[in-house]
């Protein structure tokens, strides 16, 4: 048998070997495809199948617009002028080249020593599904699950049967100061079909920088709490990788495990004081937050708020 590859939507002509080019012809075309359950013999007079597979006057079979459901086997049996039976057998596969792949949501830059999402490569409208590959500086990137991670997703359109592929690339660059170029290519895996490439993206790799800012958040707001209450201090840092955070109270380090959150449950007067956090980044010095003050006070110690109503129901003015 002969393997035939046809593009979806394009016509395909299969010749019936041995068939006389003009009637009278003794021939039979039959097909087993996604449109049939078993072999379907086509009527030489034509009929409802002509819209998908039609016998031409010369005995060839015309598929006016091949579709996914036309994949399968086509056979012709003809008797030539000398009375000898000649058989033709075709295995038809269809394909569709997708639109040019694109890298969506590309990174603006990368940070050394930490995982960075480079971007997501998207290919829409392929058949069969095909594959997406990433390239670094023109060389194929092989995902190792550690420094190079690829997350893939394949979806099929319920009506057209065509595929959409997505491939998300995450890398851990080893050093800063470089400018790697990433690209993505789609391949159908068919002979004589060149891969489709995205436009390359060139990204700067920077060393992990110092935190851009360090903020100390306190709950309850204002740092005033009743005895037995809970205080939560959160050290907010915008640095990658997240640095180690230590805590200082009244100028002295607290003997606690590093954590960006300090919880003070059931506070007493001994917890009062000035707190700050210190972020230590591997490649940079420590950075201290502005301090916050914690005060433990009975409610009402400061008197009612201005103009509030006391128990007598009369307004009091401080």
């Amino acid at each position: 048998g002969q393997n035939i590859t046809a593009r979806i939507g394009e016509p395909l002509v299969l010749s019936c070997k041995g068939a006389p080019k003009k009637p009278p012809q003794q021939l039979e075309w039959k097909l087993n495809t996604g449109r049939t359950e078993a072999w379907k013999v086509l009527s030489p007079q034509g009929g409802p199948w002509d819209s998908v597979a039609r016998i031409l006057p010369n005995g060839s079979l015309l598929l006016p617009a091949t579709g996914i459901v036309d994949e399968g086997t086509f056979r012709c049996r003809a008797t030539n002028r000398r009375g000898k039976e000649v058989k033709s057998n075709y295995r038809v596969r269809v394909y569709q080249i997708p639109g040019k792949p694109e890298i969506v949501d590309p990174a603006s830059e990368l940070t050394a020593s930490v995982p960075n999402k480079v971007g997501t490569c998207v290919s829409e409208g392929s058949y069969p599904a095909g594959t997406l590959s990433w390239h670094l500086d023109g060389k194929l990137l092989i995902p190792d699950g550690k420094e190079t991670l690829v997350k893939e997703e394949t979806r099929r359109h319920p009506e057209t049967g065509l595929f959409t592929l997505r491939s998300e690339l995450t890398v851990i660059p080893t050093q800063g100061g470089t400018h790697p170029t990433f690209s993505c290519s789609f391949s159908l895996g068919l002979p004589r079909r060149r891969p489709l490439n995205t436009a390359p993206i060139q990204l700067r790799v920077r060393e992990p920088g110092p935190p851009e800012g360090i903020q100390l958040l306190v709950e309850p707001e204002g740092g005033i709490v009743a005895p037995g209450g809970t205080v939560t201090l959160t050290c907010a840092i915008s640095a990658q990788p997240p640095p180690q955070v230590h805590w200082i109270k009244d100028g002295a380090p607290l003997p606690l495990a590093p954590s960006p959150v300090l919880l003070l449950p059931e506070v007493g007067h001994e917890d009062e004081g000035t707190y700050s956090c210190v972020a230590t980044h591997p490649s940079h010095g420590p950075q201290e937050s502005p301090p916050v003050s914690i005060r433990v006070t009975e409610t009402g110690d400061e008197g009612p708020a201005e103009g509030s109503v006391g128990e007598s129901g009369l307004g009091t003015l401080a």
Epitope: G47, P48, S51
Partner: antibody, heavy 119, light 107 residues
């Protein structure tokens, strides 16, 4: 809205001729095969003719072959049935319908037009 | 030519009844069978296409099934508006062939 409207029916003598028309709207006419189906009074449905989307290929049952001709004008979104040598047994309501191949088979119908063959 | 033998030719049923109509093809027609409903003085309306698929806008009480060359239209719970004549159609080969019809009447 997808619509088919037949016209041209009427009373005709045996041996006479009549031309039916079907005006299509609401869809891309030249993407579809088209078909005529008839129904004699009090009887069932009978296929009369089909034509492919280009108009190059036509199909008929033996009962009307060589007497009826189906045609189409894609520029005018119109389907026609030329009926010659009419007989009493051709008396029926004639419907035009969209499709007729294995891809789309008679999914939309017109309201029908009555053809009476009588002397 | 393919024959489509439809049965019964008529039936009486009540609202809420389950109704089954069968068409048998004289040879293999694959999945290429439709079912139509026709009310007096109106054009046929397609209910089921390619043996088992419900056409747009058709209530889900209608369903189609196939076993070899036997095709079945089922109305799970007959409604007042379902009293009509039903036809099957084979469109695998020319001539396209309709079944003889089944008239569903009120008991």
């Amino acid at each position: 809205e997808v619509q088919l409207v037949e016209s041209g029916g009427g009373l005709v003598q045996p041996g006479g001729s009549l031309r039916l028309s079907c005006a299509a709207s609401g869809f891309t006419f030249n993407n579809y095969w088209m078909t005529w189906v008839r129904q004699a009074p009090g009887k069932g449905l009978e296929w009369v003719a089909s034509i492919d989307n280009s108009g190059d290929n036509t199909y008929y049952p033996d009962s009307v072959k060589d007497r009826f001709t189906i045609s189409r004008d894609n520029a005018k979104n119109s389907l026609y049935l030329q009926m010659n040598s009419l007989r009493a047994e051709d008396t029926a309501v004639y419907y035009c319908a969209r499709g007729g191949d294995i891809l789309v088979s008679l999914d939309v119908w017109g309201q029908g037009t009555l053809v009476t063959v009588s002397s | 030519d393919i024959q489509m033998t439809q049965s019964p030719s008529s039936l009486s049923a009540s609202v809420g009844d389950r109704v089954t109509i069968t068409c048998r093809a004289s040879q293999d027609v694959g999945i290429y069978v439709n079912w139509f409903q026709q009310k007096p003085g109106k054009a046929p309306r397609r209910l089921i296409y390619r043996a088992t698929n419900l056409a747009d806008g058709v209530p889900s009480r209608f369903s189609g099934s196939r076993s070899g060359t036997d095709f079945t239209l089922t109305i799970s719970s007959l409604q007042p508006e379902d009293f009509a004549t039903y036809y099957c159609l084979e469109f695998d080969e020319h001539p396209l062939t309709f079944g003889g019809g089944t008239k569903v009447e009120i008991k």
